[in-house]
Amino acid sequence: ELCDDDPPEIPHATFKAMAYKEGTMLNCECKRGFRRIKSGSLYMLCTGNSSHSSWDNQCQCTSSATRNTTKQVTPQPEEQKERKTTEMQSPMQPVDQASLPGHCREPPPWENEATERIYHFVVGQMVYYQCVQGYRALHRGPAESVCKMTHGKTRWTQPQLICTGEMETSQFPGEEKPQASPEGRPESETSCLVTTTDFQIQTEMAATMETSIFTTEYQ
C-alpha cells in the first residue's frame, strides 16, 4: 500500500529515509537537457526475498540533443553499496542499514539525474529527522516519522523534534545518525484523524522535470 502524502516538515530540520522498504518506487528522472533513454525504465523498484533486497531496473539518462548514441548507465546498486559497507568500517558508523530485512539502501547517483528524487513510499516506511547545521535538537520523543495505515487511510506520524537556533561550536546534540528499525514505535494515538503536511515543492524542479506518471515528491 503506497503512502498518500509526504512526511511532515519541521522548521530548521531535514529528513531522510536511511533504508527503503520493499515495494518503494523511485522515479527515473533526468535533469534539464537530458531524458530517459528510449526503452529505459520509468522507475526503480525495491524488491527482494527473505535474505536480500535490491533495486530492480536501472535509471539511465541521455542527452536530449543526441539520438541515444551515448547512454549514461547507473552503477549497479548492489555493487556500489557493497563497496560502501566494506570500505567504511568504523565505530562511528551505525549498524548497516542494508542489513535490515526487506529494505534497500539509497541508490547511488546516476549520471545526469534530476536534482530531486521522487520516491513512492509504502506503509511502514520510516524517515529520520536531523536539525540542520546551526541548530540543535530538543527532543520530546522520537525524531522520526512512520507511514501508518489507520482506518483504511495512510498517514505519517508526527516526529517529536524541535530545532532551536542555539549554535553549537562542534557537534549538535541529537544529530546522531539513527539506527533504523524496520517497524515504527507503537503509538498511543487511537484517533482516526488524518493530518497532512504540504511538502514544499521547489519551483525549479517543477520547471525542469519532464512530466511524470508519478507526482509525489521526496528528495
Epitope: T14, K84, M88, P109, E113, Q130, Q133, Q219
Partner: nanobody, 130 residues
C-alpha cells in the same frame, strides 16, 4: 558509470599547502553533499569537510577549521579542498565522497560524520613530513 576521481595528493613539508580535487563527471551537484574524508594509518576514517550543491553550505571538522577551505566548480564537476598550514597529523589518505541531501535540499552534518555515504572515490595520499 559515475565515479569520483581524486587528485592532488603529495608529499609536503609542515606548514605547506596542497589543493585536492575531486571530479564527478555527470553528478547532479545540487542534489548532493560532496566532500572529503581522511584515514590515517591505524586510525578510523573521519569526515573532514563537505559542501552542499544546493546552497553551498559548508562543514569542517574542528581540527581543520581555519586551515582548510572547500569549494566547488560545478561547470567542471569538481570539488576542491585547499589545505594550508599542513601538520604531520594531516597525513592520511583523503577520500572524496557524496551523500544525498535530505528534504528541501537541506543537509545535517551528523549524516556526514556518520560516514554512511552513497559513493566513494579511491583516495589520494597526503603526506606531511620534513
Amino acid at each position: 558509470q559515475l565515479q569520483l576521481v581524486e587528485s592532488g595528493g603529495d608529499l609536503v613539508q609542515p606548514g605547506g599547502s596542497l589543493r585536492l580535487s575531486c571530479t564527478a563527471s555527470g553528478l547532479t551537484f545540487d542534489g548532493y553533499a560532496i566532500g572529503w574524508f581522511r584515514q590515517a594509518p591505524g586510525k578510523e576514517r573521519e569526515g573532514v569537510s563537505y559542501i552542499t550543491g544546493s546552497n553551498g553550505s559548508t562543514y569542517y571538522i574542528d581540527s581543520v577549521k581555519g586551515r582548510f577551505t572547500i569549494s566547488s566548480d560545478i561547470a567542471k564537476s569538481t570539488v576542491y579542498l585547499q589545505m594550508n598550514t599542513l601538520k604531520p597529523e594531516d597525513t592520511a589518505v583523503y577520500y572524496c565522497a557524496v551523500d544525498r541531501l535530505g528534504s528541501r535540499g537541506l543537509y545535517a552534518s551528523s549524516w556526514w560524520r556518520s560516514g554512511d555515504m552513497d559513493l566513494w572515490g579511491k583516495g589520494t595520499l597526503v603526506t606531511v613530513s620534513s
